[in-house]
């Protein structure tokens, strides 16, 4: 048993039918010794007498908020959650496997640049009576600060039957310097609460490998004088790292036929031009990858030809 | 990715182009022995992210965009003394900083093409023959050294009397790969930079 | 005290249908995942299927993928596997089997898959 | 196709001391915990060893589990000729969990 918070207690169960559970003992906080009684939520139930209460905590059941009063009055709470180790592996009820990049990805994250700022989220089906709380640094052993806000509610979406809700946060590494080579990774450490089921979720990542710049901006169409061809230009997004120079992208410029089935024109450059034919009805659009470490793609930025 | 590769103007920043040949290899490099090594641990997740030049060289200092110099902490001043004439320099007029800077990707360079030369070494004499490294990379990082034209003393190959351990060598060259191509990287905007102003 | 108990098997030809049940007791059933796992005669144990307890999961070994569906009634204390378009080599004796580092098993039940 | 791998056959005179190994990767064995089963013949697997060196109450100290890097082993001494049977391993794969690996199963003879 751990204390997550002020009052607050975790129980870790190995969690299998007929597992004898973990004995807990409860102290009740006052100076008082003699007529205190026990007693779990919502129940005028008592269980025990005296200032500690020892509980066999097998199930959700025997988890809670126990309260030890004393004529009437309460002196203290003691809230137990549980954390379900399931043949050796902690559970992973409440988020969703995003499966992306890979299998059991439970938490995303990306950066826009390398400034130490990133976005990480997390998806779920649970409506009500859970709360999030975030932890970062840098690295693990000898960690440096990483400050992370609250979790928020961010988008809901609905999947088949279900509600998906979609939660995120941002967090600040708090002293970055763009142009560093990351040797330590940045691990993220999400606590879960479902009613009285407690999980938690890490995440371990470098910042150059999470870059997802944001589109170009201002993206134009120049026509060139008896051509069918266009001058595309376009600018460095205004949340990427400076210098350019520096900081450079590379982009990639496609003309898109009304029909997905249209066979896609791609070409790809450095600057921040690009000569294309614009077909009838077609758009272009232009994304953007660090030129020198090959993180994600940004979104497009589209415009239409005609 | 297979990009169109640019070819670079011919009043280019001289290094711009080999910097650019050092990624490239680099990280086909990686890329093959990630696959070759399948079984060994060699992805970014798995190994220990060590530096080789920590301590002797200071290349992310020394070559800071000036944007960034107002940054504090990009300012971790380590200082490291450094040979100043190299024909990168040739017909700009270049501080004391870039000088320091372009010595320090030279000794960099140096102290990986010493390292992967006693690597090979060693997998040449493995009776799996499973890896060995890649003689275009070597090749570039020469180049790489001639253009930045540095007078430096010659670092003898380390050569060791024991019998290699195959499993660990494969172990550290992918710790190498890892680290050199972020110090690659670095090298690429540096250049880039240093083109552009 | 834990038991599980298979039913439902027998002989089927190919392309047809089979359900299987699982019954449990003396444990709450509905606080733990269950799987399915399958033994070809003479051959080795091999995964099948995984639910979660409440039903929100369930994941398929990929040999009875789209064929397989696993469910459970948490209220009836029964775990269930359907099985459609059966194929020759889906014969085996079929475990039902609790999750968690003790676990338990039913005593199996043979379905054989044969024109 | 099993990705954990045993030895088809162990054979051992009664007392003797036999050991089966399971062989996986980095993914599975090397990231999660080992059981063993042991199946007499015509009955459901029977778990010998949990958390890989745990014996859950009931099954005798002869029976003992490791693990080391990638690979696991079960050991029994003073070998029984209730022994007979076949034994197999059992991990996760840490991308594909809670799918069940098993190993390709051992049969222990008892000379």
């Known amino acids: 048993i751990w204390e997550l918070k002020k009052d607050v207690y975790v129980v870790e169960l190995d969690w299998y039918p007929d597992a004898p559970g973990e004995m807990v003992v409860l102290t009740c906080d006052t100076p008082e010794e003699d007529g205190i009684t026990w007693t779990l939520d919502q129940s005028s139930e008592v269980l025990g007498s005296g200032k500690t209460l020892t509980i066999q905590v097998k199930e959700f059941g025997d988890a809670g908020q126990y309260t030890c009063h004393k004529g009437g009055e309460v002196l203290s709470h003691s809230l137990l959650l549980l954390h379900k180790k399931e043949d050796g592996i902690w559970s992973t009820d409440i988020l969703k496997d995003q499966k992306e990049p890979k299998n059991k990805t439970f938490l995303r994250c990306e950066a826009k640049n390398y400034s130490g700022r990133f976005t990480c989220w997390w998806l779920t089906t649970i409506s009500t009576d859970l709360t999030f709380s975030v932890k970062s640094s840098r690295g693990s052993s000898d960690p440096q600060g990483v400050t992370c806000g609250a979790a928020t509610l961010s988008a809901e979406r609905v999947r088949g039957d279900n509600k998906e809700y979609e939660y995120s946060v941002e967090c600040q590494e708090d002293s970055a310097c763009p142009a560093a080579e990351e040797s330590l990774p940045i691990e993220v450490m999400v606590d879960a609460v479902h009613k009285l089921k407690y999980e938690n979720y890490t995440s371990s990542f470098f910042i150059r490998d999470i870059i997802k710049p944001d589109p170009p901006k201002n993206l134009q169409l120049k026509p060139l004088k008896n051509s069918r061809q266009v001058e595309v230009s376009w600018e460095y997004p205004d949340t990427w790292s400076t210098p350019h120079s520096y900081f450079s992208l590379t982009f990639c410029v496609q003309v898109q036929g009304k029909s997905k089935r249209e066979k896609k024109d791609r070409v790809f450059t450095d600057k921040t031009s690009a000569t294309v034919i614009c077909r009838k009805n077609a758009s272009i659009s232009v994304r953007a990858q660090d030129r020198y470490y090959s993180s994600s793609w940004s979104e497009w930025a589209s415009v239409p030809c005609s | 990715r297979n990009l169109p590769v640019a070819t670079p103007d011919p009043g280019m920043f001289p290094c711009l182009h080999h910097s650019q040949n050092l990624l490239r290899a680099v990280s086909n490099m990686l890329q093959k022995a990630r696959q070759t090594l399948e079984f060994y641990p060699c992805t970014s997740e798995e190994i220990d992210h060590e530096d080789i030049t920590k301590d002797k060289t200071s290349t992310v200092e020394a070559c800071l965009p000036l944007e960034l110099t107002k940054n504090e902490s990009c300012l971790n001043s380590r200082e490291t003394s450094f040979i100043t004439n190299g024909s990168c320099l040739a017909s700009r007029k270049t501080s004391f900083m870039m000088a320091l800077c372009l010595s320090s990707i030279y000794e960099d360079l140096k102290m990986y093409q010493v390292e992967f030369k006693t690597m090979n070494a060693k997998l040449l004499m493995d009776p799996k023959r499973q890896i060995f490294l890649d003689q275009n990379m070597l090749a570039v990082i020469d180049e790489l050294m001639q253009a930045l034209n540095f007078n430096s003393e010659t670092v003898p190959q380390k050569s060791s009397l024991e019998e290699p351990d195959f499993y660990k060598t494969k172990i550290k060259l992918c710790i190498l790969l890892h680290a050199f191509r972020i110090r690659a990287v670095t090298i690429d905007r540096v250049m880039s930079y240093l083109n552009a102003s | 005290q834990v038991q599980l108990v298979e039913s439902g098997g027998g002989v089927v030809q190919p392309g047809r249908s089979l359900r299987l049940s699982c019954a449990a007791s003396?444990?709450?059933?509905?606080?733990?995942?269950m799987h399915w796992v399958r033994q070809a005669p003479g051959k080795g144990l091999e995964w099948v299927a995984f639910i979660r307890y409440d039903g929100s999961n369930k994941y398929y070994a990929d040999s009875v993928k789209g064929r397989f569906t696993i469910s459970r009634d948490n209220s009836k204390n029964t775990l269930y596997l359907q099985m459609n378009s059966l194929r020759a080599e889906d014969t085996a004796v079929y475990y039902c089997?609790?999750?968690?580092?003790?676990?338990?098993w039913g005593q199996g039940t043979m379905v054989t898959v044969s024109s | 196709q099993s990705v954990l791998t045993q030895p088809p056959s162990v054979s051992g005179a009664p007392g003797q001391r036999v050991t089966i190994s399971c062989s996986g990767s980095r993914s599975n064995i090397g990231s999660n915990t080992v059981k063993w089963y042991q199946q007499l013949p015509g009955t459901a697997p029977k778990l010998l060893i949990y958390?890989?060196?745990q014996r859950p109450s009931g099954v005798p100290d002869r029976f003992s589990g490791s693990k080391s890097g990638t690979s696991a082993s079960l050991a029994i001494t003073g070998l029984q000729a209730e022994d007979e049977a076949d034994y197999y391993c059992?991990?996760?794969?840490?991308?594909?969990?809670?799918?069940?690996?098993f190993g390709t199963g051992t049969k222990v003879t008892v000379l």
């Open positions: 089997k609790t999750h968690g580092s003790h676990d338990n």
């Open positions: 003396g444990f709450t059933f509905s606080s733990y995942g």
């Open positions: 958390y890989n060196d």
């Open positions: 059992q991990s996760y794969d840490r991308y594909t969990h809670p799918a069940l690996l």
